[in-house]
């Protein structure tokens, strides 16, 4: 009877991961002084073992601890910014702001952003054709371990004052399913984190309603409150001109609610 | 089961377009497991895979390099078919060409057109 | 782009055995799948061999396929050959972009 393999819902490994992985790495340590000790050849050949040859449905987050090891990273615990669904504006914050950081900000983040990647049970190949939708398929699959892996230990870090920014344009604004509502959430420490603050980022260009009342925005604060960390909320009403004055914070118009 | 049905004209004159149409049965081009592919045989060349449309949510196409900037493999889900369209021809392109179904449960192809030749020449 | 090398032509006597050898001149050979097609005169190619070494349904189980990671190459084993087994076989792998590549085939002459 002939083998076949496994068809996934979801789209296969992107084209040219290991060299995009390398790649990222060299660029990466060649940027940031404090990891130019990292061997990328040995942080892929640990990314590597965290998924090939195991079965794409059956990830631990133990597959991932050699990859882990390799790229711990110290980042200013009080300059932590979380996002859920508004990772470009976010990351445009972090490019202006230089000393706050996203997760992608990091070694590990910065890796895997926008990458998907599988493997198969018991052979040494990578999957280019489908991998495990979360959905579809299953949760415990290589990219969603490794998200919840790397989001887990960059919430667990945060310390003092720890932001997160909104999307104010979906239904809802805060997501329990999200990465940032089922897993950092939950990790941000209450005896090293004082506050989160949301950051509500407005869509459209009239959009003048207090999107910090809104009903799931009450939900995150009553979860926060409950792990006694307080919270406070903001509308970013123009995030165009907030992040002009992000880059220019002494004009003029800057002084005005943005 | 699967067949492939190709189409299209045997003579084509250097720097024009060669169009060629893969009419499919027995399966879906909008299949969410398989890849449409096109492949072409010349004694000079031998086999050569030119590129693929397949639907994933959407649609997405990979072209081989060596022929990149002139190629496009396009889905016709009304007709359950896909095409090949080759611009800029040159007598390199002069080969007999295959479409062929990549099932998606292997990295090969399991169902071919039965070829067409096209010979370019004025 | 990585190339597939594979002997012109090679020949022997019906009941023996052949193998055709497939070389990978760059990446390595057991890092992606490789596939074996037969193909005879004017006629389009059948796959006789997917993922290294499986065989779809109705292909005799004659015909067998392996890896050898220390040339970095593949082969086709036939065995108990047969005139009907006479023709030109060519192995097909990818790479990390997923670009498939062919070999330039083999012509296999059965003796006799």
């Known amino acids: 009877v002939p083998r076949w393999r496994q068809q996934w819902s979801g789209p296969g490994t992107t084209k040219r991961f290991p060299e995009t992985v390398l790649a990222r790495c060299v660029k990466y340590t060649e940027i940031h002084p404090e990891m130019r000790h990292v061997d990328c050849q040995s942080v892929w050949d640990a990314f590597k073992g965290a998924f090939i040859s195991k079965h794409p449905c059956n990830i631990t987050e133990e597959d991932y601890q050699p990859l882990m090891k390799l790229g711990t990273q110290t980042v200013p615990c009080n300059k932590i910014l979380l996002w859920s669904r508004i990772k470009d504006l976010a990351h445009q914050f972090t490019q202006v702001q230089r000393d706050m950081f996203t997760l992608e900000d990091t070694l590990l983040g910065y890796l895997a952003d926008d990458l998907t990647w599988c493997g198969e049970f018991n052979t040494s190949k990578i999957n280019y054709q489908s991998c495990p939708d979360w959905r579809k398929d299953c949760s415990n699959n290589p990219v969603s371990v490794f998200w919840k892996t790397v989001s887990r230990r960059f919430a667990e870090a945060a310390c003092d004052v720890v932001h997160v920014m909104l999307n104010g344009s979906r239904s809802k604004i805060f997501d329990k399913n999200s990465t940032f509502g089922s897993v950092e959430v939950h990790n941000l420490q209450p005896e090293k984190v004082q506050t989160l603050e949301a950051w509500v980022i407005h869509g459209g260009r009239e959009d003048s309603r207090d999107l910090c009342q809104d009903p799931t925005i009450k939900e995150l604060e009553s979860i926060i409150s409950k792990r006694n960390i307080q919270f406070s909320c903001k509308n970013i009403y123009r995030p165009d001109k907030f992040l002009q004055c992000v880059k220019n914070p002494e004009d003029s118009s800057c002084t005005s609610e943005i | 089961q699967v067949q492939l049905q190709q189409s299209g004209p045997g003579l084509v004159k250097p720097s024009q377009t060669l169009s060629l149409t893969c009419v499919i049965s027995?399966?879906?081009?909008?299949?969410?497991?398989?890849?449409w592919n096109w492949i072409r045989q010349s004694p000079s060349r031998g086999l050569e895979w030119l590129g693929r449309?397949?639907?994933?949510?959407?649609?997405?196409?990979d072209y081989a390099v060596s022929v990149e900037s002139r190629i496009i493999v396009n889905p016709d889900t009304s007709k359950n078919q896909f095409s090949l369209q080759l611009n800029s021809v040159t007598p390199e392109d002069t080969a007999v060409y295959y479409c062929?179904?990549?099932?998606?449960?292997?990295?090969?192809?399991?169902?071919w057109g039965q070829g067409t030749m096209v010979t370019v020449s004025s | 782009n990585f190339m597939l090398t594979q002997p012109h032509s090679v020949s022997e006597s019906p009941g023996k055995t052949v193998t055709i050898p497939c070389t990978r001149s760059?990446?390595?050979?057991?890092?992606?799948?490789v596939q074996w097609y037969q193909q005879r005169p004017d006629s389009s190619p059948i796959i006789v061999i997917y993922?290294?070494?499986?065989?779809p349904s109705g292909v005799p189980d004659r015909f067998s396929g392996s890896i050898d990671s220390s040339s970095n190459s593949a082969s086709l084993t036939i065995s108990g050959l047969k005139t009907e087994d006479e023709a030109a076989y060519y192995c097909?792998?990818?790479?990390?972009?997923?670009?498939?590549?062919f070999g330039g085939g083999t012509k296999l002459t059965v003796l006799g």
């Open positions: 449309t397949y639907y994933r949510s959407k649609w997405h196409n």
């Open positions: 993922d290294d070494n499986q065989r």
């Open positions: 097909q792998s990818y790479d990390s972009t997923n670009h498939w590549v």
């Open positions: 062929a179904r990549d099932p998606g449960y292997f990295y090969g192809l399991d169902v």
């Open positions: 027995g399966d879906s081009v909008s299949s969410n497991s398989a890849a």
């Open positions: 760059s990446g390595t050979i057991a890092d992606y799948y």
